[in-house]
Structure formats: C-alpha cells, structure tokens
C-alpha cells in the first residue's frame, strides 16, 4: 500500500491525523466497525491538546472513543497504553455501573457533554469519531 | 449457592450436531459473559468461546477451530447458556465446561463438564 | 501447541515448595492482561486457584502465590501436600487472537 499524504473527502485533518465525525448513532462495536471499514479506528486521545480538539468538533453530544474494558483492563482499540496515558475521566468514572437494569456493567468509554469520560453500557446508540493516521500505510493500491 | 449444572452431552456421528445447555443459579445470570472450555481426552484446556452480556450486544467471541460451525447463545430470562454444535468432527471430542466469567476475565465458577464423543 | 508455555510437570517431596513457570507474548502476558491459574484435580472440573496475577479466591490456601513480570507469570506452592496433586494450567485474554489462551497445563506429582 502506498502512504497516506492527504486526509479523505470529509475527514478532517490535525497535527497528522484525519478525524471523521458520525452525526448518527451506534452501538459501540458498530461504530468500532465502522471506522475499521475506513481503515482508521475509533479516536484515541493521547494528549489534552488532541482531547480539546476532538471536544471542540463533537460539542456536548455523547460521543464515543476507541477505549474499552470489555476484556477485563481498559484497552485503546490502537494499543497505545492506557495506564501511562492521557487520562479524563469525569470524577467517579469510571465506575463499571451495574445498576442501569440492561444486564451488565459499562465497558466502553465516551465523550460526554463537559468532554470528560465516562464508561457506559456499550449497546447505547452515540455518536463516534473515527481517526487515521496521515503517515501510516493505506490499504489501497499505489496509482500506476 | 452458585452452581452451573451441564446437560446435552452424547455420541454423535461425524457431521453431525448437538445443543449443550448450562443453567446457572444462586447469582444474577444476566450480569456475567459467559464461555465454553472444552478438554479432550488426556489433553490440555482449550478455550471455545465467548457471549457477553446485553449491555454489550450479547456479543461472542470464538476460537478459530470452531468458528462458523459452533454458536454460543444465552436466554437471561432462564438463566441459561446454549453451545450450538453444528458439523462436528472428531477432534471435537472432548468433555466440555460452562464458565462464569468474573470482572470480564477469569472463571470463577465452572460447570460439572458434559462429554460429547464424535465418532462414527 | 499452547500459546502460553508451561512445563509439562514439576515434581516435590511434602513440605517442599514449586514452582510452575507460563511464558506468553506480547499480545497476551505482555499486553498488560492478567494471568489467572487453575488447578484440575484428577476427574473433576477446573477450580479457580489465583486470579489477577497474585490474588487468592476465599478458601483457597495462603500456600499458593502467584506473579507476573513482563510476558511470564509464576505460581508457586510452598508447604507441598499431597492433595495438590493435580494438573495446573494457567490463562490470558489475548488481543491477537481475540480470546482466551491456556498453558499447556502443568503436571503436578507429589512425590
């Protein structure tokens, strides 16, 4: 594959990355789909200046990211390391809350109206933001 | 307390089928993922497959040695975990356990085990 | 072949300690995922032995410990007794193969 110079029609760019933001709903691993489908993946915040940017676009509207701890640790979907990562997580959160009656707890982290963090049940429709990087090799065929 | 009690175990022609069920008491059955261990004969543990709970979309997971042939379901409402078996093979032959799963990653409680036997 | 590494047995006289050595990678072990152990006696189920690295379920004796480090994880039982005597495996989630991965299983004679 050749390497991506330039973001997709739609998508924006920001220090190196391309940004696409849903105004629809999806559960969680729909949306996590979605974005693999583009070749990118859910957003992974990885410093405050990225979190302000994405926060700026989404506006107070739930939205979700590419973490989740469905497996038992939180994960990015990229493999960047949560534990020495950005982290900002509303206070409390996250509290893998049991209570909501759905059957389960929250495993997947979203975007909520201040910004801040949150885990929630991962079957709720939000919105999402999908990432790419510039610099990363695209699966499409170089032009001859 | 809690308990996982297994049924549908048997003798089955290669290409055949099979359900097993596992029905789970002394907990709240719709709060865990649930999965499926199997142990052939004088063999090691080997991981089949996995269904989350409704929060998460009832999604599963499956080892690839089984996948497109096996499906997990569950029916919360009676506290039940189904294997689908479908085109079984001989190497399926095993003794197979329901798991409850703790904190979305380790089983703390296991079924009694049902031996399901391939052959022709 | 497993994709956690296990030896296939340990043997020990009563009161002596073992210990049961399961090697992953860095999609499993190394990927931050906790290691968990299981000991199967003979003709029964598995029973959770330690979970989270290092954590005893209520019952199970202070005799067993575990620990990880990097991409391996240890368990060991000090004080052997002859009811030990049993298959130990240990588990991880694994990202590349999205599911759980055991050890081989570890052969346990008391001698």
């Known amino acids: 594959g050749s390497e991506r110079t330039c973001c997709p029609v739609n998508w924006v760019e920001h220090e190196r990355s391309c940004y696409w933001f849903s105004r629809s709903g999806k559960a969680w691993a729909d949306a996590d789909n979605y974005c693999r489908l583009e070749d990118a993946h859910l957003v992974v915040v990885t410093s405050w200046e990225e979190q302000k940017f994405v926060q700026h676009h989404i506006g107070p509207v739930n939205t979700w990211m590419g973490l989740h701890d469905q497996n038992g640790p939180w994960k990015w979907v990229d493999g960047t390391d949560y534990e020495t990562g950005f982290k900002n997580w509303r206070p409390e959160q996250p509290d893998d809350w049991y209570g909501h009656g759905l059957g389960g707890g929250e495993d997947c982290a979203h975007f909520t109206d201040d910004g801040r963090w949150n885990d929630d049940v991962c079957q709720r429709p939000y919105r999402w933001v999908c990432e790419t990087e510039l610099d990363k090799a695209s699966q499409e065929p170089p032009l001859l | 307390q809690i308990q996982l009690v297994q049924s549908g175990g048997g003798l089955v022609q290669p290409g055949g089928s099979l359900r097993l069920s596992c029905a789970g008491s002394g907990y709240t059955f719709s709060d865990h993922y649930m999965d499926w261990v199997r142990q052939a004969p004088g063999k090691g543990l080997e991981w089949v497959g996995r269904?989350?709970?409704?929060?998460?979309?009832?999604?599963?997971e499956y080892a690839a040695s089984v996948k497109g042939r096996f499906t997990i379901s569950r029916d919360d409402s009676r506290n039940s975990l189904f294997l689908q078996m479908n085109s079984l093979k001989t190497e399926d032959t095993a003794v197979y356990y329901c798991a409850r799963i703790r904190d979305r990653y380790y089983f703390d409680y296991w079924g009694q085990g049902a031996l399901v036997t391939v052959s022709s | 072949q497993s994709v956690l590494t296990q030896p296939p047995s340990v043997s020990g006289a009563p009161g002596q300690r073992v210990t049961i050595s399961c090697t992953g990678s860095s999609s499993n072990v190394g990927a931050g995922y906790d290691v968990h152990w299981y000991q199967q006696l003979p003709g029964a189920a598995p029973k959770l032995l330690i979970y989270?690295?290092?954590n005893r379920p209520s019952g199970v004796p202070d005799r067993f410990s575990g620990s990880k480090s990097g991409t391996s994880a240890s368990l060991a039982i000090s004080g052997l007794q002859s009811e030990d005597e049993a298959d130990y495996y240990c588990a991880a989630w694994d990202d590349s193969l999205n599911g759980v991965v055991f050890g081989g299983g570890t052969k346990l004679t008391v001698l």
């Open positions: 989270g690295n290092s």
């Open positions: 269904i989350r709970y409704k929060a998460n979309s009832y999604s599963t």
